[in-house]
């Protein structure tokens, strides 16, 4: 396989992943290969290594299809576990309510000496990056509970007590923002490293797939909306009625303060909180129990709705108005979002046409805001901030390119709630 | 490739009418904002008119110079652009030009037609 | 209406040179400024807009510098093509208007 380098790129049957990505290659015949791991190195080359999987110290060890090593029946998922909590399923496999496990290709800024774990809690999986302890053996082992491998005799290590902190921001700061890629991935059949990073995410229109850094953090969500029961959530042995919000206590994260989770009827929905880039006060301050830095002293006054204070500023970002004109005609769809900004003081145009769900013309224009004034049929929908339009753009970059070649019928809309900036649970920025 | 062909130029009587035409190739027409600019002989240019796209409503706006006198229009199934002229006076003597605009409403003029003369004058 | 005014009105210089053509607004249209070439008997053709971004197909020795209300278009080493007459145009609001126009013509 020819790899071509260029910029912070490898190239690998005809598909680009940034350094230090990992996947499994997709071989012909056999498809995915699970048992052999990819990695795209500094210099550009793909290194490939065969996975090498430990003793297991049972009698009949069990092959799962998804999953190169064999387990022991013990380190399997409970099948007698109680009804009442849900069950979660990620890339065809299904997960029990407390399970925790390994995830591939999430992060696109992972470190070396990281690897994902996921959740499974109450329907939804939850992953995030865990920086694993320095091995100091030649031949380390997978443990049931830790995505890490751990020297033999350290198999009692649990992930709190690796060096690292799950939630640190790895020191690659090029992919802060990403209105997450894989949303929009083809489908894994024949596709290189064909991990569909978030498999059926465009049937769960609630799936969140942000990993902008938020006070160090970087959280993984996948929210399953199938089940549905009562007119309340249920969320780690809690009951949460209708419009209420609360910060998911994880088994293996414990309280996460940069995801908020809202009661919507019968499902919970969860975001990750968006810390601002600058903040009005020159020394922001963290706080135990909050996600993001605070100003001392300081506290915005919520408006119906959003929380923005006088100035406009949204947790201590500023926040710019957001307009949107949608024109339907003969089966065509075009819908411009704009942004109007102060410095320099414009309006950014971005025109989508959208025709049977594939995308026939996308560009970007920048006009004065006195040329935008001319244009009646623009109407005020939400305010949002400098960094929540970084994500916006980035993910349309991507969608645009997708878009153009497969049919897409929730992609742009999805991508526009990226704007809406939600009201903040009291005192959380 | 990208062109824009005017015709329906030539001689008219002051407070005559005329009506020129425009006829757009190798892009997609319905998007764009289309503009006439012309120029007198030996003069530098001067914008006349703008239609902007069916999904802009069609929004028209003219120089003062040519307010109530003449008319932007356009068929988009067909890539034309019009200019119906009347109560022409003698100042209106000039090249036409059918203009596109970079885009649905940015103002600059990125394709430019090879023009049509009209000549008013009794 | 804003006012755009150039100058000078006809510059005389040689094939290699460089020069210099200025366009003045009578208020601030910040970057939304295009430049146009029109040689004799032609249509004219986009060079420059946004002030400084140049059009598909233009060789890299025009380059369009200001903001504001003060703007110049640079040329460097002058081809015998580059000969001929050179408008500003504000792209601000509407009406957009150009300058007078500049003469560009062979010493």
């Known amino acids: 396989e020819q790899v071509k380098h260029s910029e912070t790129y490898c190239m690998f049957q005809d598909k680009k992943y940034r350094v230090g990505e990992r996947w499994h290659p997709y071989l012909e015949p056999y498809g995915l290969v699970y048992c052999v791991n990819c990695i795209c190195s500094e210099n550009g080359n793909v290194l490939c290594s065969r996975v090498r999987c430990p003793n297991v110290h049972c009698l009949s060890p069990v092959h799962i299809p998804h999953l190169c090593c064999p387990r022991c029946p013990d380190s399997l998922p409970p099948v007698n576990n109680k009804v009442t909590s849900k069950s979660c399923e990620y890339n065809g496999t299904t997960y029990q309510h407390g399970e925790l496990f390994v995830a591939e290709g999430l992060f696109q800024n992972r470190q070396p000496n990281q690897c994902t774990q996921c959740s499974c809690s109450e329907g939804n999986v939850y992953c995030g990056l865990k920086t694993c302890p320095k091995l100091t053996c030649a031949f380390p082992v997978s443990v049931p509970d830790s995505c890490c491998r751990v020297c033999r005799g350290d198999g009692e290590l649990s992930w709190e007590h690796s060096d690292g902190d799950i939630f640190r921001q790895p020191a690659n700061r090029e992919a802060r923002h990403s209105y997450h890629r894989s949303h929009y991935d083809p489908p894994p059949s024949r596709q290189a490293g064909g991990l569909s990073r978030f498999p059926g995410a465009r049937s769960h229109r609630g799936a969140l797939m942000d990993s902008q850094q938020a006070s160090g953090t970087i959280v993984q969500i996948v929210i399953n909306n199938k089940h549905k029961h009562g007119q309340v959530c249920v969320s780690n042995g809690k009951t949460y009625s209708h419009g209420e919000s609360w910060h998911p206590n994880l088994r293996a994260f414990g309280i996460v303060e940069c995801v908020l989770c809202t009661c919507n009827v019968t499902k919970q929905e969860c975001k990750k909180i968006h810390c601002p880039n600058r903040y009005p006060c020159k020394y922001p301050q963290k706080i135990d129990g909050k996600c993001c830095k605070v100003c001392p002293g300081k506290k915005a006054k919520e408006l119906p709705g959003q929380s923005f204070d006088n100035k406009g500023y949204f947790c201590g970002e500023e926040t710019m108005p957001v307009y949107e004109s949608v024109f339907m005609e003969d089966g065509e769809t075009t819908r411009k979002i704009a942004l109007e900004t102060e410095r320099p003081p414009q309006v950014e145009v971005h025109v989508w046409t959208i025709r049977k769900g594939i995308l026939q013309h996308f560009h970007i224009e920048k006009i004065s805001k006195r040329m935008f004034e001319e244009l009646p049929h623009f109407k005020l929908v939400t305010r949002t901030t400098l960094s929540q339009w970084k994500i916006f753009t980035e993910g349309e970059a991507q969608i645009s390119q997708m878009c153009s070649s497969r049919v897409c019928r929730t992609e742009l809309e999805d991508l526009v709630k990226v704007l809406y900036l939600e009201r903040s649970e009291k005192g959380h920025c | 490739e990208v062109q824009l062909v005017e015709s329906g130029g030539g001689l008219v009587q002051p407070k005559g009418s005329l009506k020129l035409s425009c006829v757009a190739s190798g892009f997609t027409f319905k998007t764009y904002a289309m503009h006439w600019v012309r120029q007198a002989p030996g003069k530098g240019l001067e914008w006349v008119a703008r239609i902007r796209s069916k999904s802009s409503n069609y929004a028209t706006y003219y120089a003062d110079s040519v307010k109530d006198r003449f008319t932007i229009s356009r068929d988009d199934s067909q890539s034309m652009l019009y200019l119906q002229m009347n109560n022409l006076k003698t100042e209106d003597t000039a090249m036409y030009y059918c203009v596109r605009d970079g885009g649905y409403y940015v103002g600059y003029f990125d394709v430019w037609g090879t023009g049509t003369t009209v000549t008013v004058s009794s | 209406d804003i006012q755009m005014t150039q100058s000078p009105a006809t510059l005389s210089a040689s094939v290699g040179e460089t020069v210099t053509i200025t366009c003045r607004a009578s208020?601030?249209?910040?970057?939304?400024l295009a430049w146009y070439q029109q040689k004799q008997g032609k249509s004219p053709h986009l060079l420059v807009y946004?002030?400084?971004t140049l059009a598909e197909g233009v060789p890299s020795r025009f380059s369009g510098i200001g903001s504001g209300t003060q703007f110049s278009l640079k040329i460097n080493s002058l081809q015998p093509e580059d000969f001929g007459s050179y408008y500003c145009q504000h792209h601000y609001d509407t009406p957009p208007t150009f300058g007078g126009g500049t003469n560009l013509e062979i010493k």
């Open positions: 208020e601030n249209i910040y970057s939304y």
């Open positions: 946004n002030a400084k």
